[in-house]
């Protein structure tokens, strides 16, 4: 049987100063059991964008329903972009682990790029 | 229609080992995580374990006695109980994993059940 | 581990009446919450998923409610089929999977 993949569509992403980013990425299977989380950026000093489970997210939101069963469409929303929002952000699959989720497979990314509001 | 059949449960003597064994079948069985979840007599449900692909996951009271594993080109799950104890007694029932919120899951189909007696 | 306090215990409710149980959680586990039904003999059935999800082809007179870590099961006008034993089980924070203690709801 085939691995869980996970797909990020679209390599990069323009998105105007004070706009929404759409940042897209699916999952192939439900398992691994385990969650999906947004990063920014890679390795040790990677910023979390989005972990449904803790924290608090004020300017993302998830495109599908959070109570949708069986879900595989892990993309999300992010508010009111800056450019200091501009970066690469990663899907990444985690498998559950005790005490703690390891990761299992990253998305390719996709690079968000800021245009700045016309003065 | 999603069935589930568990069989394979009896009487055993302490130290003493089974394999139930849950055939599935009306949904894509590969595709979802399964879980034993048992019942001893007159109590309540406890999870046992739980498997996706090649994640597993146990209770405590079972850790490193029991081994749950899957054959997808069976769409059959099992469960290998070793070293048996009186408490092990109950009603083992598969179930199908549901998942919502991104992770975490609950049982949306059970099958019936299958008795183990652990008695000498 | 996360533990679930099913209260009462056992629930006397007349035909037609409410019958409202409760699962408490020992730690918050947002609404990541499921209900289960058991009648004698038989195996346990999904009623409700995500606090407040009815599972498909249960009856609207069951409801949930609640998040954190307290929940309630309401089933508005109690049919003689619903006579049985329900469960919570959360799936916020696992492994393990934990389950309630259970509510019986027997005829008064």
């Known amino acids: 049987e085939e691995e869980l993949q996970v797909i990020q569509p679209d390599k990069s992403v323009l998105v105007a100063a004070g706009e929404t980013a759409t940042l897209r990425c699916t999952a192939t299977s439900l398992i691994p059991v385990g969650p999906i989380q947004w990063f920014r950026g890679a390795g040790p000093g990677r910023e979390l964008i989005y972990n449904q489970k803790e924290g608090h997210f004020p300017r993302v939101t998830t495109v599908s329903d959070l109570t949708k069963r069986n879900n595989m469409d892990f993309s999300i929303r992010i508010g009111n972009i800056t450019p200091a929002d501009a970066g690469t952000y990663y899907c990444v699959k985690f498998r559950k682990g005790s005490p703690d989720d390891v990761e299992f497979k990253s998305g390719a990314g996709t690079e968000l790029s800021v245009r700045a509001k016309p003065s | 229609e999603v069935q589930l059949l568990e069989s394979g449960g009896g009487v055993v003597q302490p130290g003493g080992s089974l394999r139930l064994s849950c055939a599935a079948s009306g949904f894509s069985f590969s595709n979802f995580a399964m879980t034993w979840v048992r019942q001893a007599p007159g109590k309540g449900l406890e999870w046992v374990s739980t498997i996706g692909s090649g994640d597993t996951y146990y209770a405590d009271s079972v850790k490193g006695r029991f081994t749950i594993s899957r054959d997808n080109s069976k769409n059959t799950l099992y469960l290998q109980m070793n070293s048996l104890r009186a408490e092990d007694t109950a009603v083992y029932y598969c179930?199908?994993?549901?998942?919502?919120?991104?992770?975490?899951?609950?049982?949306?189909?059970w099958g019936q059940g299958t008795l183990v007696t652990v008695s000498s | 581990e996360i533990v679930l306090t099913q209260s009462p215990a056992t629930l006397s409710v007349s035909p037609g009446e409410r019958a409202t149980l409760s699962c408490r959680a020992s730690q918050n586990v947002k609404n990541d919450l499921a209900w289960y039904q058991q009648k004698p003999g038989q195996a346990p059935r999904l009623l409700i998923y995500a606090a407040r999800i009815r599972e498909t082809g249960i009856p609207a007179r069951f409801s949930g409610s609640g998040s954190g870590t307290e929940f309630t099961l309401t089933i508005s006008s109690l049919q003689s089929e619903d006579f049985a034993v329900y469960y919570c089980?959360?799936?916020?924070?696992?492994?393990?999977?934990?389950f309630g203690g259970g509510t019986k709801v027997e005829i008064k």
């Open positions: 089980q959360q799936y916020y924070d696992w492994p393990p999977f934990t």
């Open positions: 179930a199908k994993d549901s998942t919502v919120s991104w992770s975490g899951d609950f049982f949306d189909y």
